[in-house]
């Protein structure tokens, strides 16, 4: 054989390739060895032109040999040398994170090293680099900014060799609200992009809840608890599903009555409803909004309307929640069953935002009576809540 080369070299693997012998051969015998590494020999088929070398030692120079066999005959041996990459450190972790300091720890690579390169970068693009000695497995970061997301990376060094980098992400404390209890507190912490956030009911880190925060509508800080937009999610669900919540928080979903009760029990909240249909928009805001606990069957309180959609929720004020399997409405018939949805029905509805998507039959669709009546199913609807005193909090934060 001829033209022996190695490719795809990592810290533990390499691929040997060669040009086959001109004559037909039975097999090739491959052997490879490195400093302090016993020789390994493998025999492969005569029509093979590459072989994966595995379980190699990192940062080691290997000598690779190959010759062909045909019966008792052996060809001359060809040789190549290659060096495996330096393996990366492992388990990089940020601990003891404070407002301006953090401790980075890691496990060393298998190969011996001459040092480590540490790089840490904040979200605003500030980058710092430091080289530490070969026996170091931790490093204290100082002079960090409070309430800031950092990415820390580490790379092992061995002379000219450099390992791949590994990274960890951490956030320094010093937030106004380390455990935000709603989206308004997340916003006051400096998060201004709408999307998924973790909130902590009553500020308790054991009560984490993933929510979608609307950070743009009317100043932002809203927990979205209902979204209808395309009809992909089934909203004709039972009591248990409405209590717990369902759907994809980035798409169509219901956050859950238990969650609404816990959130609105944290203080005084306001409700906002955003509606869109064929380029038209409308909204309704209620400055008092709460949902009772399971004992009250999640009784609705909604008062103090303003907006452009019309005051359709007032009809439902004081009502308990109804689903097809738990009828709490004041009608002889089961409203949820009749209108294929769930809501704080009375007899039956002015609002049916959990109705059948796209159904323009009377009272069956996604309805907000005082905007589009009962014979038009609205294309997009969101219900969301935030503290009633959000404007005051926002002003205080800006002054601070």
């Amino acid at each position: 054989p001829s033209g022996l080369v190695t490719a795809n070299i990592t810290d533990s693997e390499a691929l040997a390739r060669w040009q086959p012998a001109i004559a037909t051969v039975d097999s090739y015998v491959i052997s490879y060895t490195g400093e302090k590494v016993p020789e390994i020999t493998r025999t492969v088929s005569g029509n093979t032109v590459e072989y994966a070398l595995t379980d190699l030692e990192p940062a080691t120079e290997y000598t690779l040999r190959i010759f062909a066999e045909k019966g008792p005959q052996k060809s001359s041996t060809i040789t190549a040398k290659f060096t495996t990459d330096l393996d990366s450190p492992r388990d990089l972790t940020a601990t003891e994170v404070q407002s301006e300091t953090a401790l980075l720890t890691w496990r060393p690579p298998r190969a011996s090293v001459t040092g480590y390169l540490l790089v840490y970068e904040s979200v605003d693009g500030t980058v710092k680099e430091v080289i530490v000695g070969p026996d170091t497995t931790s490093y204290s970061l100082a002079d960090l900014s409070p309430s800031t997301h950092y990415t820390a990376k580490i790379q092992a060094l061995n002379g000219p060799l450099r390992s791949n980098m590994i990274q960890t992400i951490f956030t320094t404390i010093g937030l106004l609200y380390p455990f935000p209890k709603d989206c308004s507190q997340a916003m006051l912490n400096g998060d201004t992009t709408s999307g998924l956030y973790t909130i902590y009911l009553n500020g308790d880190k054991a009560e984490a809840l993933e929510v979608f925060c609307d950070m743009t509508s009317d100043g932002g800080g809203w927990i979205v608890f209902l979204r209808r937009k395309n009809g992909r999610e089934n909203f004709y669900q039972n009591w248990k599903a409405y209590a717990a919540g369902f759907g994809d928080r980035r798409e169509e979903f219901w956050l859950g009555l238990d969650n609404l009760n816990k959130i609105t029990a944290q203080g005084q909240y306001e409700l906002r409803v955003d509606l869109r249909d064929h380029g038209e928009t409308a909204f309704a805001v209620y400055d008092k909004f709460s949902v009772g606990d399971a004992k009250t069957r999640y009784k609705l309180k909604v008062e103090g309307y303003s907006g452009t959609a019309g005051d359709s929720m007032a009809y439902h004020n004081g009502r308990s929640f109804s689903t097809f399997d738990k009828d709490t409405d004041s009608a002889i018939t089961n409203c949820a069953l009749s209108y294929k949805g769930a809501f704080w029905y009375r007899n039956c509805h002015r609002v049916n935002l959990m109705g059948r998507y796209g159904d323009n039959n009377h009272s069956q669709g996604v309805n907000w009576f005082h905007w589009k009546g009962h014979e038009h199913s609205i294309q997009f609807a969101e219900m969301k809540l935030r503290p009633s005193n959000f404007r005051n909090l926002e002003g205080r934060r800006k002054r601070a």
Partner: antibody, heavy 120, light 107 residues
């Protein structure tokens, strides 16, 4: 107890104006919508006008739109109906009615009425 | 406007009999229907709201049913104090409209 007392009715010539008042007591006035409902002699009930609890929304029957104005003074627990350009067909007993809810819905308490006669 | 049609217009009935008054809406109104009783020279009184809910203080012999366009007020056993005119009213949309009334008198 909950009570509504109307006043301001009387005999008036066609084209003239009259202002009806309704004094409410026994409930939190601004928590409820209020209405005027009339009944012509020997006839049935006709809803005339309604106003939301906050006073922010007002509604009228087509027969009085542009001529009558409903208003409320929540500080005084009072409801009003300003009637302009009166016609003979406006002759009726005018009832003040409290709604069961903050928005127009169900008339759960009624006053005893005040008579308006439009005649030359 | 939504038209409300009551029948019958007059209903002579002996004391103790069951009385049924019907009310039909000209369009679908879910359960947005109320029933009132009016005695001569008196203001109307709310009996039933939301089609089937008995107002506080109203005797249980009164009941309401129906949904959509067709509604019924039933007096299970007519008492002397029940002789009056009964009106249905839709609260579904403005203007709120009443039926023309059903007069229940002594037979």
């Amino acid at each position: 107890q909950v009570q509504l007392v109307e006043s301001g009715g009387g005999l008036v010539q066609p084209g003239r104006s009259l202002r009806l008042s309704c004094a409410a007591s026994g409930f939190t006035f601004d928590d409820y919508a209020m209405h005027w409902v009339r009944q012509a002699p020997g006839k049935g009930l006709e809803w005339v006008s309604g106003i939301s609890g906050s006073g922010g929304s007002t509604y009228y029957a087509d027969s009085v739109k542009g001529r009558f104005t409903i208003s409320r003074d929540n500080a005084k627990n009072s409801l009003y109906l300003q009637m302009n350009s009166l016609r003979a067909e406006d002759t009726a007993l005018y009832y003040c009615a409290k709604d069961k809810y903050p928005v127009l819905d169900t008339f759960d308490i009624w006053g005893q009425g005040t008579m308006v006669t439009v005649s030359s | 406007d939504i038209q409300m049609t009551q029948s019958p217009a007059s209903l002579p009935t002996p004391v103790g009999d069951r009385v049924t008054i019907t009310c039909r809406a000209s369009q679908y109104i879910q359960g947005f229907l109320n029933w009132y009783q009016q005695k001569p020279g008196k203001a109307p009184k709310l009996l039933i709201y939301d089609a089937s809910n008995l107002e506080t203080g109203v005797p249980s012999r009164f009941s309401g049913s129906g949904s959509g366009t067709d509604f019924t007020l039933t007096i299970s056993s007519l008492q002397p104090e029940d002789f009056a005119t009964y009106y249905c009213q839709q609260s579904y949309s403005t203007p709120q409209t009443f039926g023309q009334g059903t007069k229940v008198d002594i037979k």
